[in-house]
Amino acid sequence: LQDLCSNCPAGTFCDNNRSQICSPCPPNSFSSAGGQRTCDICRQCKGVFKTRKECSSTSNAECDCISGYHCLGAECSMCEQDCKQGQELTKKGCKDCCFGTFNDQKRGICRPWTNCSLDGKSVLVNGTKERDVVCGPSPADLSPGASSATPPAPAREPGHSPQ
């Protein structure tokens, strides 16, 4: 009898009420493996969850989170609010970027400000939690002999930027 059930493919179940005939999964249910004695109820993506993939007879529905939220868990069992710019998502949730780092998106991690001096440039605009520094001309370009329509703003390295 066990052998008969093992012949039932995914999308069906082994129906004990019908001499172990392989019956198709009823609507809104699925079996992802063969030899199942019952079909599982399809997940419904409701409320903060939206449908990413419809349920089929052989696979469960897959959910995503509505705009402004992202999934937690292997099967999107929870929705977590997106972080703000100037924050990053850690194991404990959204945390402000540390001094010297920034994130200009609602996802991803905080990245270090650009080190302008590595490119032989100076800092034109200081960095913030939300924005990278803006590098300007190199200090050599700003020497008295260099032609410039307007006098340069005093440059400061990223490490001295107030938050």
Epitope: G47, V48, F49, I66, G73, S77
Partner: antibody, heavy 116, light 107 residues
């Protein structure tokens, strides 16, 4: 900010019905399922069921299937729970709560006392 | 249904103590575990979701850990305002189920 304001305490007779309300503010009501929780000193917290205000679709704990009826009115941002055929076992505090896979905001709670 | 067990129903501690409250599920809940605080006036607040994520506005002295069937909530430096009852809750499967609660008191 997100808030759930529940209706006031109820004293009801055995066999009667009562409808509790939960008014949401500070967020898009239709975008989140609303769940209802029962709390008693003996049994602690018990999940009653949930309603999707967008569609009116519901899920119930089998234990409460014949006891509770969940509805929602999108126009007033309010969820309702009717409790029927009340007995002393239904005396409890009832909470509504918003769902994200976890309950991030809870209502103020409504105390229901069933007594003759 | 998944059973959630908090074996310690009440706990006495001193201000400044490190307190750990445990919770066990009757089957693997794959980190789908949340913690709530209920104050004596009945107000309920989310503390931690998905095992270890701190809800916004919750002090960093609260932390959560665990996996599989065993989970815990830790308060690293107990304050007077932490006097409350703490509940765990699983979101792995319907019906959602809660632990019986652990009441925290000051020694």
């Amino acid at each position: 900010q997100v808030q759930l304001q529940q209706s006031g305490a109820e004293l009801v007779r055995p066999g009667a019905s009562v409808t509790l309300s939960c008014k949401a503010s500070g967020y898009t009501f239709a975008g989140f399922e609303m769940h209802w929780i029962k709390q008693t000193p003996v049994h602690g917290l018990g999940w009653i069921g949930a309603i999707d205000p967008k569609t009116g679709g519901t899920d119930y704990n089998q234990k409460f299937k014949d006891k509770a009826l969940l509805t929602a009115d999108k126009s007033s941002n309010t969820a309702y729970m009717e409790l029927r055929s009340l007995t002393s076992e239904d005396s409890a505090v009832y909470y509504c709560t918003r769902d994200l896979g976890y309950f991030d905001v809870w209502g103020t709670g409504t105390t229901v006392t069933v007594s003759s | 249904d998944i059973q959630m067990t908090q074996t310690t129903s009440s706990l006495s501690a001193s201000l400044g103590d490190r307190v750990t409250i445990s919770c066990r599920a009757s089957q693997d809940i794959r980190s789908n575990l949340n913690w709530y605080q209920q104050k004596p006036d009945g107000t309920v607040k989310l503390l931690i979701y998905y095992t270890s994520r701190l809800h916004s506005g919750v002090p960093s002295r609260f932390s959560g850990s665990g996996s599989g069937t065993d989970y815990s909530l830790t308060i690293s430096n107990l304050e007077q305002e932490d006097i409350a009852t703490y509940f765990c809750q699983q979101s792995e499967k319907l019906p959602r189920t809660f632990g019986g609660g652990t009441k925290l008191e000051i020694r």
